[in-house]
Amino acid sequence: QTSVSPSKVILPRGGSVLVTCSTSCDQPKLLGIETPLPKKELLLPGNNRKVYELSNVQEDSQPMCYSNCPDGQSTAKTFLTVYWTPERVELAPLPSWQPVGKNLTLRCQVEGGAPRANLTVVLLRGEKELKREPAVGEPAEVTTTVLVRRDHHGANFSCRTELDLRPQGLELFENTSAPYQLQTFVLPATPPQLVSPRVLEVDTQGTVVCSLDGLFPVSEAQVHLALGDQRLNPTVTYGNDSFSAKASVSVTAEDEGTQRLTCAVILGNQSQETLQTVTIYSFPAPNVILTKPEVSEGTEVTVKCEAHPRAKVTLNGVPAQPLGPRAQLLLKATPEDNGRSFSCSATLEVAGQLIHKNQTRELRVLYGPRLDERDCPGNWTWPENSQQTPMCQAWGNPLPELKCLKDGTFPLPIGESVTVTRDLEGTYLCRARSTQGEVTRKVTVNVLSPRYE
């Protein structure tokens, strides 16, 4: 009678096992083992028991012990079951971003693993089991469908295999796939709202605001603002489910013309875009040209106003004739024109908007000096001892220097309050002098003596 120990073995793939072949007779003619596996007999004394090390066991096998005794030949089989965990446990790749409300199919593929009767495939969201199925086929495939919800955002989906060898006295061997982290999102169908100037002048700054409501998760939204090829760098403010992106835009002469302003919102694998046109224009202030900014009285002066070729100008409220970018007027300079402002107003239509620019120049008229009766009376009569202020105003541009002297030496204190004395009486020669020349005028001061009763 041949016996084998152990009669049943479960061992890891590539592992080794010691198998003892025994026979009931003391002096067997033959005692051995038949197996395709690499074997090595242990060196042990005795005739009726032999131990073999069977190594590199890669698959289930049934080595057979045999013995030949006087009463005949017999055999005994041992059953070697190989176990190994799957070589590949993988979730089929999916885009990490998924829109809320979409049906998502999770597919797990399992390659290898044995014994298959003890192998189970589990699909999980976090630690929650979504589906559990035995591993069938090579590769085994298990699928489940998940309706994507907002609260799934950031959830980890994974696939786990369980090789349960606890009934065989071993443990539960688990293999888990790399997790798939789901990023859920909501991007509304409405395009973002874009607020910006319709027209923008060269070498100025404008403000662009792009906003959108109903986003999830708003912090993950990417905002791209651009004017033509120029990427803008917005400051983004987030609300609960909204954002507002504000950017400053500077334009140069190179940008002149119609430019596309775009605001694109990217969330997940979707985007929404709003386009607007902005007209970049160049409109320098009109130029007011005086023949000379400073002229002498009586000189003929030409005032010209020149503006952008497409502008329409008015000069001192008078439209150009014909209506266009140039206007002029002629005048003979009078003292009254000194300090006179000549204002040119230009209007340019840009993308249906009227843009106004003004420029003002002042004319300086040189005249005088003048001394006349009104401002410098020729005769003053004042009671003695009274308080008086002699007044004499010389006119002219530049303002003349005025001196009033009696006998060439005694000054009349113009503009000062004085007590009238006998010494003040007399005729004074008032002289007004400027770069334009000089004038003189005689002023007589009479002093009335008090009457003694």
Partner: antibody, heavy 117, light 111 residues
Framework: EVQLLESGGGLVQPGGSLRLSCAAS????????MSWVRQAPGKGLEWVAF????????YYADSVKGRFTISRDNSKNTLYLQMNSLRAEDTAVYYC??????????WGQGTLVTVSS | QSVLTQPPSASGTPGQRVTISCTGS?????????VHWYQQLPGTAPKLLIY???NRPSGVPDRFSGSKSGTSASLAISGLRSEDEADYYC???????????FGGGTKLTVL
């Protein structure tokens, strides 16, 4: 870490008896073949006795056959050597050793047995 | 008188290569049984040094190597060091005796 610790050695008169013990740890004792090997003072190593993992088969060197008995208690992880009718030539350091199936892979530190009147 | 014969002593200077022989018969080494070597440092238990003719257990330096041919085997130690000073034993199995055999041992001295 595999450890084998012998005890029970000492001085005994010729014709006397002694029981050696070997406490095993760090491996599955019940799956291991075990042996006793001795070394007389200043001499070489000599195999003495051998026992199967389950205690079912025992083998002895001719020099000790009929006088020594090897046994084991797998529940206590302990190997024994009962030595009777001791002779002066049995004086030696006795080592317990684990047998791999081809060689002795782990040895204890030994216990000295002195047989003298 | 051991059935496996070893020279009682061997010596060498540090850095040298030393060889220890082990001779058996047709019922042991010559029958195809593997040879194993043990090192016994002074005052300690034997330790497995080489198994299955030429394999080293983990932790044994590669300065130690073994070989087997016919009815004999040998242990070679290269780059000899003072800490190699010990007794070295060969071991095999004898089918006619149904017993494990040890050589008489070789005392290695590092000069």
């Amino acid at each position: 870490e595999v450890q084998l610790l012998e005890s029970g050695g000492g001085l005994v008169q010729p014709g006397g008896s002694l029981r050696l013990s070997c406490a095993a740890s760090g491996f599955t004792f019940s799956n291991a073949w075990m042996s006793w090997v001795r070394q007389a003072p200043g001499k070489g190593l000599e195999w003495v006795a051998f026992i199967w993992y389950d205690g079912s088969n025992k083998y002895y060197a001719d020099s000790v056959k009929g006088r020594f008995t090897i046994s084991r208690d797998n529940s206590k992880n302990t190997l024994y050597l009962q030595m009777n009718s001791l002779r002066a030539e049995d004086t030696a350091v006795y080592y317990c050793a684990r047998y791999s199936g081809w060689y002795f892979d782990y040895w204890g530190q030994g216990t000295l047995v002195t047989v003298s009147s | 008188q051991s059935v496996l014969t070893q020279p009682p002593s061997a010596s060498g200077t540090p850095g040298q290569r030393v060889t220890i022989s082990c001779t058996g018969s047709s019922s042991n080494i010559g029958a195809g049984y593997d040879v194993h070597w043990y090192q016994q440092l002074p005052g300690t238990a034997p330790k497995l040094l080489i198994y299955d003719n030429n394999n080293r257990p983990s932790g044994v330096p590669d300065r130690f190597s073994g070989s087997k041919s016919g009815t004999s085997a040998s242990l070679a130690i290269s780059g000899l060091r003072s800490e190699d000073e010990a007794d070295y034993y060969c071991q095999s199995y004898d089918s006619s005796l149904s017993a494990w055999l040890f050589g008489g041992g070789t005392k290695l001295t590092v000069l």
